[in-house]
């Protein structure tokens, strides 16, 4: 059955209630210089209204503080209102390493990110940090890498490993959850000149992730004890016509080309899904495509296999698919899939259909294919035109969290966290934010607060309290010392 009745119950005490933000552009200078100027001034209030410095007097200044960054203040205010336990945000690789290598490290950018994390911890909010978050419009690579073919160049993977190592070193004492790359399976939108370019770029992204994970595992895990994964775009697929066998096959093929493409090599075999490889090869043989998945060496398979500590999925909607044979040598045509918009479904302004039961099906599919592992939904949300009473978002959150709860309580999926997308919207972009672009709060915040404080959808009489030991797993003394670090 697609939809089942709502359940009453709670998520575990260690469940991560998160909110996701995309790339945080670091502020280059703290915006409160008044605290760093040691001079005394007299204000000529009745005359020329200027400040005149008093010579020979030097005042004690206070050291720079994280909250001197205006941006950080704003984020903290928003996060405090969200009442989340976790904040997922992305670093800007190009800002941290403008030359693409360690020859020029932007220490100020790293200080800014360290401030975001440490100030969050003071509010009891832990960070999940994404190292690389490309978007359709902007690849987000340092310029020198961008102009040297970006992800088509295998050396970009090595550059990424060096960048990841720097971030682990500088932030890893505070950050326990890392995402290397956000939605590498969506870079096909950019590297789409040919299927072979798409698969070549994907291969280098997989290698980049694996190199970063291996580095963390070898060098940083023993002392930092964190966990590292990558976030896959993971919409569910349903046959447009449930009575057509070809539509069922198309739905499974969508999942193979979209999720298994990255999940299979990392979670399971070290190689691409056999179904995907065979499908592309059969089209090649029939002269319908010149695409081919890269052949992996034994060393590459060993490098990739098992390089995830948890499964991270970005899930927004369910797509209705049908089979349509397409000629051409691009990723989109290689999969022979046509999408159908079901106009009877509740949809957002960007035509994202609200189909809550898709997330539960996705979680079961992942467990069936890749085993019983910790799963985080690292982004999930909908765009809603309303600037105050965003009822569509409230409905979406309530219904999707219901299905996640069913997956946890009934299907026994090891779901560890849900991160709503996103904290604040950007000007002239689809309205996914809990806050407007000028930081005005929407009513969905109260709704999410209520779910978080209840740990889900409890029975009338059940307690939402967690014991202190479970709720505060961080060592408070360690945390105190860490926060005092310059």
């Amino acid at each position: 059955k697609e939809s089942t009745p709502d359940v009453q119950g709670q998520f575990p005490c260690d469940f991560s209630w998160g909110v996701t933000e995309s790339v945080l552009k670091p502020e280059s200078v703290a915006s409160s210089p008044q605290f760093s100027d040691p001079h005394l001034y007299v204000w000529n209030a009745t005359g020329n209204r200027l400040l005149h410095r008093v010579e020979g007097v030097r005042l004690k200044t206070r050291p720079a503080q994280c909250t001197d960054f205006v941006n950080i203040k704003k984020q903290l205010e928003m996060l405090a209102r969200m009442k989340v336990t976790h904040y997922r945000f992305a670093l800007d690789w190009a800002s941290v390493l403008p030359t693409g290598n360690l020859s020029a490290v932007n220490r100020q950018a790293l200080r800014y990110y360290r401030c975001v994390v440490s100030e969050g911890l003071k509010l009891g909010i832990s960070a999940m940090v994404t190292l690389y978050y490309p978007t359709h419009a902007h690849l987000g690579l340092p310029e020198p890498l961008l102009h040297a073919d970006g992800w088509l160049n295998p050396s970009t993977a090595e550059a990424f490993q060096a960048y990841a190592g720097l971030c682990f070193q500088e932030l890893g004492d505070l950050v326990k959850l890392w995402i290397t790359i956000n939605e590498p399976n969506r870079l096909s939108d950019i590297y789409n000149r040919s299927g072979n370019d798409t698969y070549g770029a994907a291969h280098n992204l997989l290698v980049a992730h694996a190199l970063a994970w291996r580095l963390y595992d070898r060098q940083f895990r023993p002392s930092q004890r964190g966990a590292v994964s990558l976030s896959l775009h993971a919409d569910w697929a349903e046959p447009a016509n449930p009575y057509a066998d070809s539509h069922w096959r198309a739905a499974e093929r969508f999942l193979q080309f979209e999720i298994a493409w990255f999940a299979e090599p990392l979670f399971k075999t070290g190689d691409y899904p056999a179904a995907m490889r065979e499908y592309i090869a059969s089209k090649h043989r029939r002269g319908l495509s010149s695409s081919a998945l890269p052949r992996l060496t034994e060393a590459e398979r060993r490098l990739l296999k098992g390089t995830v500590d948890f499964c991270a999925l970005n899930h927004f909607t369910t797509r209705f698919v049908m089979h349509e044979q397409l000629a051409g040598s691009r990723y989109d045509s290689d999969r022979d899939i046509q999408f159908l918009q079901d106009i009877t479904r509740l949809s957002s302004p960007t035509r994202l259909a609200v189909i809550p039961w898709g997330v539960r099906k996705l979680l079961r599919w992942v467990r069936r294919n890749y085993g019983d592992m910790d799963i985080y939904i690292t982004a999930s949300g909908i765009d809603d035109q309303a600037l105050e009473d965003d009822r569509l978002r409230k409905y979406y959150l309530g219904k999707y969290l219901q299905e996640v709860l069913k997956a946890y309580l009934i299907d026994k999926v090891r779901i560890k966290g849900y991160y709503a997308f996103k904290l604040a919207e950007e000007k002239s972009k689809p309205r996914f934010g809990f806050f407007t672009s000028d930081f005005k709060a929407k009513s969905s915040i109260q709704f999410y607060n209520k779910v978080i404080s209840s740990r889900g959808f409890p029975f009338e009489n059940s307690s939402s309290r967690c014991s202190q030991t479970q709720e505060n797993t961080e060592c408070t003394v360690c945390l105190f010392l860490v926060q005092k670090k310059p």
């Epitope: 902007h138 690849l139 690579l141 020198p144 961008l146 102009h147 040297a148 073919d149 970006g150 088509l152 590297y191 789409n192 000149r193 040919s194 051409g328 691009r330």
Partner: antibody, heavy 122, light 107 residues
């Protein structure tokens, strides 16, 4: 800011070879981009001839493949077009350009040399 | 090779007018299309890449659109300095190919 400066003869005899040089300043040709040659015929038709990449890799337009070669001198930051056994039909203005085929701008030539007008005549 | 067909081949318009030039690709090129402007006696200059991305320094009166096989370049509020020949170029597959050009004149 990158600048491309071209040099080479304005007149070449049929069946001879044409050699053109593009000198690049403001950017190392080994750091990135695709260093490209394009020509424009008297009727203004533009033809993309081929490139040499930042890593030394080449691609030539199949219609010219056996007649041209694009090389470089990394120590001088120059790249070259060698066009063998030219005919009157190769009379054109030859441009060198910087192509950024996988970044931003996508698949485009964002900086051009001043052009060299070449006449093939005996 | 992909054939790029531009129309019209020449166009007369008055200052302040809005004009549109079209470019048709012989096969689907997604959004891999660039537009160049070549003023008389000058070298071609990049205006727009990836169908709609304005190159640095290009005035906002220029805009591009389209995907697949049909593309347009629009110039709103025509200025005297816009007198030039405009070329489209596909950047999907090698060899890259250009349209035959549209010569813009002022009435």
């Amino acid at each position: 800011e990158v600048q491309l400066q071209q040099s080479g003869p304005g007149l070449v005899k049929p069946s001879q070879s044409l050699s053109l040089t593009c000198s690049v300043t403001g950017y190392s040709i080994t750091s990135g981009y695709y260093w490209t040659w394009i020509r424009q015929f008297p009727g203004n038709k533009l033809e993309w001839m081929g490139y040499i990449k930042y890593d030394g890799g080449n691609y030539y337009n199949p219609s010219l493949r056996n007649r041209i070669s694009i090389t470089r001198d990394t120590s001088k930051n120059h790249f070259f077009l060698k066009f063998y056994s030219v005919t009157a039909e190769d009379t054109a203005t030859y441009f060198c350009a910087r192509g950024d085929y996988y970044a931003s701008p996508y698949g485009a030539m964002d900086s051009w040399g001043q052009g060299t007008s070449v006449t093939v005549s005996s | 090779d992909i054939v790029m067909t531009q129309s019209p081949s020449s166009l007369s318009a008055s200052l302040g007018d809005t004009i549109t030039i079209t470019c048709h690709a012989s096969q689907d090129i997604d959004v891999w299309l660039s537009w160049y402007q070549q003023k008389p006696g000058n070298v071609p200059q990049l205006l727009i890449s990836k169908s709609s991305i304005l190159h640095t320094g290009v005035p906002s009166r220029f805009s591009g659109g389209g995907s697949g096989t049909g593309f347009t370049l629009t110039i709103s509020s025509l200025q005297p300095e816009d007198i030039a020949t405009y070329y489209c170029q596909q950047g999907l597959s090698y060899p890259f190919t250009f349209g035959s050009g549209t010569k813009l004149k002022i009435k």
